[in-house]
Interface confidence: low
């Protein structure tokens, strides 16, 4: 079950809930946003203060890391299984250091299996964080510092830090290095969403959340 099911079962307060893998008893803890845009959102990524190191291994990105009450990555395996059993939307919420907020909403999102390197699939972009997708289309395989699946002769994950769906290396990386205010410009390995803030701007906060399309 996901946060949408939790919401429908009557839990309408933001917080950490125990979710289960599809067709399994395996559990995982996630933060559920039960207020934004109708609620029922499963938070799959959050950056807000630089307290968690996102330069992690393939296995760590697979199973998840961090703290669901703060900065964390939910885990590629759970997200892959979840998004392959029904249609999901992905909303990416961004904050810059000047007090501005923006979002990108994809009307269809899923991750391929681990055998296919958790390749990202996205369709139907709307929102205020750029008319062009900052996640390269068609979607790329996921890469980490120990799993180089990008389209660059370089190793984007090592160079730009963090696990992401790098192209060569592409216009985004929400898992890059966290830079504090006044140190956040012209940082090519920062938290980047090119079609909103440009190549060298490192964002203050990001949240990636998913919800069933028919919620």
């Amino acid at each position: 079950r996901d946060c949408a099911e939790v919401f429908k079962s009557g839990h309408t307060t933001n917080g950490i809930y125990t979710l289960t893998f599809p067709n399994s008893t395996e559990e995982i803890k996630a933060y559920c946003d039960m207020e934004a845009g109708g609620g029922g959102w499963t938070i799959i990524q959050r950056r807000e203060d630089g307290s968690v190191d996102f330069q992690r291994t393939w296995k760590e990105y697979k199973v998840g890391f961090g703290n669901p009450s703060g900065e964390y990555w939910l885990g590629n395996e759970f997200v892959s299984q979840l998004t392959n059993q029904q249609r999901y939307v992905l909303k990416i919420h961004l904050k810059d250091w000047e007090g501005n907020e923006a979002y990108s909403l994809y009307e269809h999102f899923y991750l391929s299996s681990e055998e296919l390197n958790y390749r990202i699939h996205l369709k139907g972009l709307t929102g205020t964080a750029g008319k062009i997708s900052s996640i390269s289309q068609p979607g790329n395989d996921f890469s980490t510092k120990d799993g180089d699946n990008d389209k660059c002769i370089c190793k984007c994950s090592q160079m730009l830090t963090g696990g992401w769906w790098f192209d060569a290396c592409g216009p985004s990386n929400l898992n890059g290095m966290y830079y504090p205010q006044r140190q956040n410009t012209n940082k090519f390995n920062g938290i980047k969403w090119y079609y909103w803030k440009g190549s060298g701007y490192s964002l203050k906060a990001t949240t990636m959340m998913i919800r069933p399309a028919d919620f």
Epitope: T185, N186, F188, G198, G200, Y201
Partner: antibody, heavy 121, light 106 residues
């Protein structure tokens, strides 16, 4: 004294290829981003491409993406620009430029004398 | 992409004049702006970086100001050696130049 010397400019037919080289001296080449900037006859300056210190990060002007590649040889203090599928609008003086930034990709503080590339049939 | 618009395109002035060149960015570039001087047949020379920081060896009659989207280059008292073309350049999001301002003898 910092010096940047470009070579390889020539007259080439549309669709042709050319490889520009830049020999650097007077500074620790491997510690700087390097850049190619061009200037069409009687026109303004246009950033073309640049490359990180270790060669592992590259950026290109949209109109040259897929046609131009930038590379460097830090052991020999050399910068290269391989230009394929050349068009008339690529005609320009090409400058080899040092980017002042070490960690920050910033302004361009040293420029070569330029090498002329003419694309014409 | 960020567009840089310089004005005027041409400026006619005399030795001793105070000269101001304006550069406007299509979106905020904070203070990541440089000014260059170029003389005919020569490579550009960096004058000012980070909007207002004068490069070593550049005469103090040159100054830069501004932040966000509006920037100016000022030459407090134009000298014969200053007749040239001046370019602004942003380096906040990729690297783009203004179209240039030619400062010519009146």
């Amino acid at each position: 004294e910092v010096q940047l010397v470009e070579s390889g400019g020539d007259l080439v037919q549309p669709g042709g290829s050319l490889r520009l080289s830049c020999t650097a001296s007077g500074f620790t080449f491997s510690k700087y981003w390097m850049t190619w900037v061009r200037q069409a006859p009687g026109r303004g300056l246009e950033w073309v491409a640049n490359i990180k210190e270790d060669g592992n990060e590259k950026y290109f002007l949209d109109s040259v993406k897929g046609r131009f590649t930038i590379s460097r040889d830090n052991a020999k203090d050399l910068l290269f620009l391989q230009m394929n599928s050349l068009r008339g609008e690529d005609t320009a003086v090409y400058y080899c430029v040092r980017d002042r930034g070490i960690e920050v990709a910033g302004p361009f503080d040293y420029w070569g004398q330029g090498t002329l590339v003419t694309v014409s049939s | 992409d960020i567009q840089m618009t310089q004005s005027p395109s041409t400026l006619s002035a005399s030795v001793g004049d105070r000269v101001t060149v304006t550069c406007r960015a299509s979106q905020t570039i904070i203070n990541w702006l440089a000014w260059y001087q170029q003389k005919p047949g020569k490579a550009p020379k960096l004058l000012i970086s980070k909007a207002s920081s004068l490069e070593s060896g550049v005469p103090s009659r040159f100054s830069g100001s501004g932040s966000g989207t509006e920037f100016t280059l000022t030459i407090s008292s134009l000298q014969p050696d200053d007749f040239a073309t001046y370019y602004c350049q942003q380096y906040n999001r990729y690297w783009t130049f203004g179209q240039g301002t030619m400062v010519e003898i009146k």
